[in-house]
Amino acid sequence: EVEKTACPSGKKAREIDESLIFYKKWELEACVDAALLATQMDRVNAIPFTYEQLDVLKHKLDELYPQGYPESVIQHLGYLFLKMSPEDIRKWNVTSLETLKALLEVNKGHEMSPQVATLIDRFVKGRGQLDKDTLDTLTAFYPGYLCSLSPEELSSVPPSSIWAVRPQDLDTCDPRQLDVLYPKARLAFQNMNGSEYFVKIQSFLGGAPTEDLKALSQQNVSMDLATFMKLRTDAVLPLTVAEVQKLLGPHVEGLKAEERHRPVRDWILRQRQDDLDTLGLGLQG
């Protein structure tokens, strides 16, 4: 906490400029008007303030806006955002995607911090749902963002937003999350033709039920083994040998290398040996 002291003669700041880097913390506290700071926040990031000087500037804003900063200030926080606590951020009302982008840019290249997680949570809750533009933005900065959400939170994603999802965005999703996302993807891509549909739906198939896998097996999709290994075991078990052969196409030979791993292992054990022998892969049920 900086002591309240009078500003020395001639040092009162008339604007936020580089001369302030030479001010001691107590001088910043005494000589910089909080309202001036709020209107010139965009300049702060162009000036090499030390971390402790930034603490003083934050303190001045906190005093000016005890109920939370207005968005006009938030949008220009820049590196000062890194000084904010989740408690500070919970007081904010962030509605502009531009503000969100500006603050995510500050944290770019780092893991998602508690501050960023709180900011995103406030933003999404304010919007009521995870729309396409927001999802586009969030997955661009944090490819794993989608998979960090609970199934309940994912249920607020409208099918139209699924178009923004890239395969890598789903890399860390677990089956419960894919169970929620798959029906949305199916709805989003329903008007696409066979091959294009498969390219889009492929990343979501970890949430597909048996009947959809059966339908895909009729469409010459040539699913790769990596995708097959991510399918739900309970969805794979009822498939016949012929259906799996059609589903995988030329990739069916890969079953041999995966025969000890789920879901292949469990599927093999459910099949008649005669049927497995038709594959000519030496699989033992």
């Epitope: 880097i21 030479f22 001010y23 001691k24 913390k25 001088e27 910043l28 090499p48 030390t50 971390y51 402790e52 000087q53």
Partner: nanobody
Framework: QVQLVESGGGVVQPGRSLRLSCAAS????????MGWVRQAPGKEREFVAA????????YYADSVKGRFTISRDNSKNTLYLQMNSLRAEDTAVYYC???????????????WGQGTLVTVSS
């Protein structure tokens, strides 16, 4: 004790270029910025340029933007200031600084060089 030694100053005509160097006698740990500050005769000190730790962010005073470039060579422990299109008003003593102290650039634990004089005159 780390020392900063500036070099490269001198007399130069307007419109010409000069490159200042600042060599550190040892590795400076934990600095937040390395930068250049200048002081013209009878005037206040003025920030010129700075570079943050890890060369993540570059800062320039409005008066030198587009003309001066700050850089550093970690392998040589040296900071540079490339000054192009020099003007008479750039005449000053240029100081190199390593900012470690949280209490501003005038904090007690920062390192400063002795300065090198740049005179821009026809």
């Amino acid at each position: 004790q780390v020392q900063l030694v500036e070099s490269g100053g001198g007399v130069v005509q307007p419109g010409r270029s000069l490159r200042l160097s600042c060599a550190a006698s040892g590795t400076i740990f934990g600095y937040q910025y390395m930068g250049w500050v200048r002081q013209a005769p009878g005037k206040e000190r003025e920030f010129v340029a700075a570079i943050s730790y890890g060369s993540i962010t570059y800062y320039y005073a409005d008066s030198v933007k587009g003309r001066f470039t700050i850089s550093r060579d970690n392998s040589k422990n040296t900071l540079y200031l490339q000054m192009n299109s020099l003007r008479a008003e750039d005449t000053a003593v240029y100081y190199c600084a390593a900012i470690l102290d949280g209490d501003g650039w005038d904090g007690g634990y920062n390192y400063w060089g002795q300065g090198t004089l740049v005179t821009v005159s026809s």
